[in-house]
């Protein structure tokens, strides 16, 4: 959590951002909140990016003001105009690209004063893994697949019964470049699995950590997946 205060002017206002991560090709949110004002027309929001000459986005007098917007952000940004009055200056970024990573500044002016806070935005690719029994294999085998990751993640298998066991000798992981030549499909195969056990396939890079669990019994198969973004800290 980064909390910024005004440096000069009438008074300082508190501006709060949250470091976050964007998934390539999807929409991202750059979070920023501030002490609200009574009049929308008195609020100015400016989003800036380190190393970029033009503005990322500007909102003033109740509407977008995009004449100074940098070309790389044109048509890709929006603030939630109906939420500005309650202190939400968050920015929606369409079609996140690797090049969108960097340090952003959320700069706010209201009738109460000025304030700003920085935000570290990471970009990459992350997706939920799915673990299935591979019935085509000669022995009992599990197959863990996740369609989109970048940078290349690590894959670790674990089991509930054999806690702390190292499965690297009985697993094989491959990374297949997707058609856009950036993200990769992750496929990991675990051999010699036993029934009445829960296995976890954990995929992790510096942006996200995802886990796919599978419980195999004689009568049923249960699956569960979850994904967690790393380093989402507020400022």
């Amino acid at each position: 959590l980064i909390i910024g205060f005004g440096i000069s002017g009438r008074h300082s206002i508190t501006v709060t951002t949250v470091a976050s991560a964007g998934n390539i090709g999807e929409d991202g949110i750059l979070s920023c909140t501030f002490e609200p004002d009574i009049k929308l027309s008195d609020i100015v929001i400016q989003w800036l990016k380190e190393g970029v000459l033009g503005l990322v986005h500007e909102f003033k007098e109740g509407k977008d003001e995009l004449s100074e917007q940098d070309e790389m952000f044109r048509g890709r940004t929006a603030v939630f105009a109906d939420q500005v009055i309650v202190g939400n200056a968050s920015l929606r970024l369409k079609n996140v690209q690797l090049t969108d990573a960097g340090t952003y500044k959320c700069y706010i002016i209201t009738s109460k004063g000025k304030g700003n806070a920085n935000l570290e935005y990471k970009t990459g690719a992350f997706s939920m893994p799915e673990v299935n029994v591979d019935y085509n294999a000669s022995s009992e085998t599990l197959r863990c697949e996740a369609p989109r990751w970048f940078p290349q993640p690590t894959v670790v298998w674990a089991s509930q019964v054999d806690q702390g066991a190292n499965f690297s000798e009985v697993s094989n992981t491959s990374f297949e470049l997707n058609s856009e030549n950036v993200t990769m499909k992750v496929v990991s195969v675990l051999y010699n699995v036993t029934i009445n056990n829960t296995y976890s396939c954990m995929i992790e890079n510096d942006i996200a950590k995802a886990t796919g669990d599978i419980k195999v019994t004689e009568s049923e198969i249960k699956r569960r997946s979850h994904l967690q973004l790393l380093n989402s800290k507020a400022s």
């Epitope: 090709g25 929409d27 917007q69 044109r74 929006a78 105009a81 079609n95 058609s179």
Partner: antibody, heavy 122, light 107 residues
Amino acid sequence: QVQLQESGPGLVKPSETLSLTCTVSGGSIISYYWGWIRQPPGKGLEWIGYIYSSGSTSYNPSLKSRVTISVDTSKNQFSLKLSSVTAADTAVYYCARGSGLYAAPDYGLDVWGQGTTVTVSS
Amino acid sequence: DIQMTQSPSTLSASVGDRVTITCRASQSISSWLAWYQQKPGKAPKLLIYKASSLESGVPSRFSGSGSGTEFTLTISSLQPDDFATYYCQQDNSFPFTFGGGTKVEIK
């Protein structure tokens, strides 16, 4: 409801500049993206460029060196200028509004003018 | 630029038929896709936005689906008024680009 009307000369000489204006009626030009699209005879649609009401523009790279789109909010109009025209620029030119949530051009072009035919010939 | 490829380019069908038109993007565009209908001498008309959302006033026999790079426009029961040319368009990133069009004609 919002209506768009293109206007400008139907005949332009090669190497000259094509100039068209789109007048927005029944609504405000403010807080929207406005675009120009063209369609050569018997062919598909080609996106020329967009302008936001505050003046921010984005052009098709294939036409960028020749295109200028401007806006006049006081007249509720936006304009297209295409320089150094050739016969390949002969087309029906449409103006349209980009729609979307929170003023971003995400939801297609929801309002179109009826189109104006421009022929490039000497 | 993102290339949009439509197939087929021409489709012959009869009233009452179920018609499907495909649009492929050269890279992922998430759900940022619109579909238009155009009749000869007329401006295009927005049918579907954000891949599957029906524009106000458009009959419910039109539907859109897909995400990423593969999209479809489906007309569940073709009506006489539906014989036209259909275009897809990505509004994921500038420059916005259109597919080459699919002409739906009477069989």
